[in-house]
């Protein structure tokens, strides 16, 4: 039960996280005009990964796409790439994890296959979350650098006679959405990996062995794995150690050490 809950929760958390990463990537407010201690302009500038927007005091907003690829800063391109990689990995991870869910039965899929798929999706979610966090952090670092550069320009002047209205940019809503979404995807991935451990059969197939004092007569229990018997029953292959210690996920009764062949 705990494994199912962990896996299900991991899936839901990752799903929310990836939806957040997609939302952040599409949002226009990655950087917004800093209004603090700045000349108050009648226009409000904000920028995303794909376009920049200007909102007039009337509320009229005009957005322009970055219609160049080569003319864009390398850092922006890197952030775009990280976010897209994060989305793609997350989407694949979601697809894989749907089939890996313990509560969904697809044909006669082995539990070991489900465990592998759960681990795969978990790793994908972790990498996806890290990509999003990295992308947002790179952009934030770029903003901080530019902010202090423009602040220095504002107070030291540019050497020319003409003053310019320095538009400084600060963190936009998309950065916070991205950080939270990346974190959620990461947490979801970790939960999937934890769930995988509960799903996976142990590597050594120990047989149930009955030891007698004489040491001569040994009875072996063939078939160390118990097959699952259908939807809703125990879907994990349990090993029988000394009669098979039961986990909370088990529904069926397992043979004790006194059940001989």
């Amino acid at each position: 039960m705990a494994v199912t809950a962990c896996q299900g929760l991991g899936f839901v958390v990752s799903l929310i996280g990836i939806a957040g990463i997609i939302a952040a990537t599409c949002m226009d407010q990655w950087s917004t005009q800093d209004l603090y201690n700045n000349p108050v302009t009648a226009v409000f500038n904000y920028q995303g990964l794909w376009r920049s927007c200007v909102r007039e005091s009337s509320g009229f907003t005009e957005c322009r796409g970055y219609f160049t690829l080569l003319g864009l800063p390398a850092m922006l391109q890197a952030v775009r790439a990280l976010m897209i990689v994060g989305i793609v990995l997350g989407a694949i991870g979601l697809l894989v994890s749907i089939f890996a869910l313990k509560c969904i039965r697809i044909g006669s899929m082995e539990d070991s296959a489900k465990a592998n798929m759960t681990l795969t999706s978990g790793i994908m979610f972790i990498v996806s979350g890290l990509c999003a966090i990295a992308g947002v952090s790179v952009f934030a670092n770029m903003l901080v650098t530019n902010f202090w550069m423009s602040t220095a320009n504002m107070y030291t002047g540019m050497g020319g006679m003409v003053q310019t209205v320095q538009t400084r940019y600060t963190f936009g809503a998309a950065l916070f959405v991205g950080w939270v979404a990346g974190g959620l995807t990461l947490i979801g991935g970790v939960m999937m990996c934890i769930a995988c451990r509960g799903l996976a059969p142990e590597e050594t197939n120990y047989k149930a062995v009955s030891y007698h004092a004489s040491g001569h007569s040994v009875a072996y229990k063939p078939g160390g794995f118990k097959a699952s018997t259908g939807f809703g029953s125990n879907t994990k292959n349990k090993k029988i150690y000394d009669g098979g210690a039961r986990t909370e996920d088990e529904v069926q009764s397992y043979p004790s050490k006194h059940d001989y062949v």
Partner: antibody, heavy 119, light 113 residues
Framework: QVQLQQPGAELVNPGASVKVSCKAS????????MHWVKKRPGQGLEWIGG????????NYNHKFKGKATLTVDKASSTAYLQLSSLTSEDSAVYYC????????????WGQGTVVTVSA | DIVMTQSPSSLTVTAGEKVTMNCKSS????????????VTWYQQKPGQPPKLLIF???TRESGVPDRFTGSGSGTDFTLIISSVQAEDLAVYYC?????????FGSGTKLEIK
Amino acid sequence: QVQLQQPGAELVNPGASVKVSCKASGSTFTTYWMHWVKKRPGQGLEWIGGIRPSDSNNNYNHKFKGKATLTVDKASSTAYLQLSSLTSEDSAVYYCAMGAYYSNSFAYWGQGTVVTVSA
Amino acid sequence: DIVMTQSPSSLTVTAGEKVTMNCKSSQSLLNRGNQKNYVTWYQQKPGQPPKLLIFWASTRESGVPDRFTGSGSGTDFTLIISSVQAEDLAVYYCQNDYVYPFTFGSGTKLEIK
């Protein structure tokens, strides 16, 4: 067509206050900023401030802070400019102007109210 | 505050002539976000309120004759009337509508011979 109606003239005593009205018709009043501009004889135009009727958000020219107060009455689609502690320096034509939707320009203007401060 | 300096303060021309008036701002009025210059030109005829002619430095307001042309970027702006008509007798103001407080130039008075 947007129309801004202002009273023709106001005669007030020094030290007193005056409230100039500007009634808008022919447009969605709450959508656009309403600005006030002062024009003294032989001088240029001076922006007093602007107010957005939808949320009463406003911007004042610091020169007029304490002198001018901008308000709106959404029900009657009317903007008001209140001038306090009047002196002869406040004698001027006061225009209300509605901001454009697409830019920060003043697209529509009232005919102006002549405020005369005289004992 | 941004200071808008207009020149000349007045000029007298004959009908049909080309007129150029200038406006210089103390700070750049170019918004890099959309590459637009936030300068507006108004025409004020005697006894009338000002009328919007040009916004964003070069965009003509609907209904304004095409003999009026605005140009310039950053701090230097120009209003050109290609062929002056008698009805163009007015004072022309440029305005900063980028940084608060919005400021107007002192005006250029156009007189017709």
